[in-house]
């Protein structure tokens, strides 16, 4: 269980409408409640069944919420972050960071600045380039036969 765990990191803008049971998710984190080591960011800890977030389907447990209605969530006390969500109004815009594990190993989150959180384009671009080079080399080889 000690193998390196890499992540594809993607960001998404999620617009939620506060439903009859609210936004329908819980959060952890903050400068006074670091839930992820070396990271005081705000993370989704639970999504309520049939709540607004669950019905929308895009927000996932473990997602990091970067901003609410354009307001950055960096360096906030936990309760201040909670109050921000509770007072965000009827239409709520969330900037969210998803992290998808791309290699077998223990599931977890990396802190900010951890080099193993790899943006998706940094994985896909080299793969695409290698594929193109291999195809070109194969065609040249066939021509020489």
């Amino acid at each position: 269980m000690n193998g390196r765990v890499d992540y594809l990191v993607t960001e998404e803008e999620i617009n939620l409408t506060r439903g009859p049971s609210g936004l329908g998710f819980n959060i952890v984190g903050g400068t006074d409640q670091q839930y992820v080591s070396n990271d005081s960011g705000i993370y989704v800890s639970r999504i309520k069944e049939n709540g607004a977030a669950a019905l929308d389907g895009r927000l996932q447990e473990g997602d990091k919420i970067l901003s609410v209605n354009g307001q950055d969530l960096k360096n906030l006390l936990h309760q201040d972050a909670v109050d921000l969500f509770r007072n965000a109004g009827y239409a709520v815009s969330l900037r969210v960071q998803h992290r998808l594990q791309v290699q077998n190993g223990p599931i977890g989150h990396r802190g900010e600045g951890d080099p193993s959180g790899i943006p998706i384009f940094m994985v896909l671009v080299p793969v695409f380039a290698l594929t193109m080079v291999a195809a070109w080399a194969f065609m040249r080889y066939r021509q020489q036969l």
Epitope: N26, I27, R46, V82
Partner: nanobody
Framework: QVQLVESGGGLVQAGGSLRLSCAAS????????MGWFRQAPGLERDFVAE????????GYADSVKGRFTISRDNAKNTVYLQMNSLKPQDTAVYYC?????????????????????WGQGTQVTVS
């Protein structure tokens, strides 16, 4: 995984007081929102009160505001419900509940679906 054990229930006369306790076992107790619910015979389990991770944020059902007070001691992994001016309609089984993190909605919205872990309940009877 959190295990919850309630205590402090009993029989009390109208106008009297009781203090319920809920002892939690498991890691990171302070990261949990804790709540109290109650269920009278034949009725749904209703929200009573909840308290945020640090104790700074609390919410109450309208029916108990001004009479009940929820508190927690993270060093003891325990949450309390002080019940004063009890009425016969407060008779019910009282359940302690826990959920990881803080709900992003006010407690006006709270239902039993918002909590994942439950105690076995303690009976409160007001005569």
């Amino acid at each position: 995984q959190v295990q919850l054990v309630e205590s402090g229930g009993g029989l009390v006369q109208a106008g009297g007081s009781l203090r319920l306790s809920c002892a939690a076992s498991g890691p990171t107790f302070s990261s949990y929102t804790m709540g109290w619910f109650r269920q009278a015979p034949g009725l749904e389990r209703d929200f009573v009160a909840e308290i945020g991770w640090s104790g700074g944020s609390t919410g109450y059902a309208d029916s108990v505001k001004g009479r009940f007070t929820i508190s927690r001691d993270n060093a003891k992994n325990t949450v309390y419900l002080q019940m004063n001016s009890l009425k016969p309609q407060d008779t019910a089984v009282y359940y302690c509940a826990a959920v990881i993190g803080s709900p992003t909605d006010y407690s006006d919205y709270r239902s039993s679906l918002d909590y994942d872990y439950w105690g076995q309940g303690t009976q409160v009877t007001v005569s």
